[in-house]
């Protein structure tokens, strides 16, 4: 049995495979913000994790993923404000009792030091500092990511 | 009520750096985008360019060459200077918070009243 | 760059009457991503309009707008004499964000 927001987030993520393909992302697109290999957008209004989720795919986008303790830390290096919290496409997965990112990858257990429960209708925002379980209703700031497509031949330093 | 203030010399000569400064009051310039926006006297609006609080930019290429937009977030305020300027650079010169395109908002929702430049020897 | 032209350049109407206001966009302005805004002499543009139909805060039910893709439409139902103004149409979904060349709406 899914929840809602496992519902809402599977449906999402199926009508974005769906689409037909477009050309590599060789740069981001205005008012995105580069980070590395991504292109970022921080909201400045707020919503709760489902609309945030749905919001990024009308822009062509997702959820921000992160892979590991240096991306996490890399893109908590542009929150400028230590109170603000901003949704990422993380949620917890009632059926398989586990946080799962959108694309259907679970947590490495390594990867984040998550504050809060492990528990039905969670979801995990970031701030300039830590990693937050939150009721997914919670009203938030979120990040999107586009990917940028790797050119070959050339080595891009750090953004 | 988020108020834009411009700042900056009326006069400059030709060959010299326009330079303006606009103040940002009662709301925060974080994870909005910051612009200046110019109008010849009696003509049509043109974007010069945008800066984000972190401090990336996005210039018109019509006047890359020549725009530098900066951005102190500990006081509030961006700033526009262009250098090499001419007659063709007389206008109204506006500074704007830009909502961008996340969520329920987009373009320019709150401007400054605009501070006139002329260009003149 | 996006070209928007705005026609026609000169709207003449009387208060009461329905104003229609046209903005091509050379090319697809993406998702929608169109502004209106009015100005009067001596003062800074107002956001009318975002998203190419969303009515920005404080603007009157009166201002709606419509379109996508390449045609754009900015409609007031029935005029205010507060109303004659330069109307301008702005694209912010590709860089450079541009500007129509603007309307002016004037007493017949």
């Known amino acids: 049995q899914k929840s809602s927001i496992e519902k809402c987030s599977v449906d999402i993520q199926q009508s974005r495979n769906k689409t037909t393909e477009r050309p590599g992302l060789l740069n981001c697109p205005i008012y995105w913000q580069q980070l590395r290999e991504k292109c970022l957008l921080f909201s400045h209004t707020v919503n709760p994790w489902n609309n945030s989720l749905a919001d990024c795919s009308t822009k062509e986008s997702s959820l921000l993923l992160i892979r590991d303790k240096d991306e996490l830390i890399h893109t908590q290096n542009l929150i400028r404000d230590k109170a603000i919290l901003f949704w990422i496409g993380l949620n917890f997965s009632l059926s398989e009792k586990n946080w799962k990112w959108i694309n259907g990858s679970f947590l490495n257990s390594n990867d984040l030091e998550i504050r809060g429960d492990a528990k039905e209708n969670s979801c995990i925002s970031i701030s300039q500092t830590s990693v937050y379980s939150e009721y997914c209703s919670t009203e938030i700031r979120w990040i999107c990511q586009k990917e940028l497509t790797p050119v070959r031949n050339k080595v891009y330093p750090d953004s | 009520q988020v108020q834009l203030q411009e700042s900056g010399p009326g006069l400059v000569k030709p060959s010299e750096t326009l330079s303006l400064t606009c103040t940002v009051s009662?709301?925060?310039?974080?994870?909005?985008?910051w612009s200046w926006i110019r109008q010849p006297p009696g003509k049509g609006l043109e974007w010069i360019g945008y800066?984000?609080?972190?401090?990336?930019?996005n210039y018109n290429p019509s006047l890359k060459s020549r725009v530098t937009i900066s951005i102190d977030t500990s006081e509030n305020q961006f700033s526009l200077k262009l250098t090499s300027v001419t007659a063709a650079d007389t206008a109204v010169y506006y500074c704007?918070?830009?909502?961008?395109?996340?969520?329920?908002?987009?373009?320019?929702?709150?401007w400054g009243q605009g501070t006139l430049v002329t260009v003149s020897s | 760059e996006i070209v928007l032209t705005q026609s026609p350049g000169t709207l003449s109407l009387s208060p009461g009457e329905r104003a229609t206001l046209s903005c091509r966009a050379s090319?697809?302005?993406?998702?929608?991503?169109l502004a209106w805004y009015q100005q009067k002499p001596g003062q800074a543009p107002r956001l009318l309009i975002y998203?190419?139909?969303s009515r920005a805060t404080g603007i009157p039910d009166r201002f709606s707008g419509s379109g996508s893709g390449t045609d754009f439409t900015l409609t007031i139902s029935r005029l205010e004499p507060e109303d004659f103004a330069v109307y301008y149409c702005q694209q912010y979904g590709s860089s450079p964000i541009t500007f129509g060349q603007g309307t002016r709406l004037e007493i017949k």
């Open positions: 090319q697809s302005v993406s998702s929608s991503y």
């Open positions: 704007a918070r830009d909502g961008g395109i996340v969520g329920a908002t987009g373009g320019f929702d709150y």
């Open positions: 009662g709301g925060s310039i974080s994870y909005y985008y």
């Open positions: 800066i984000y609080h972190s401090g990336s930019t």
């Open positions: 998203g190419a139909s």
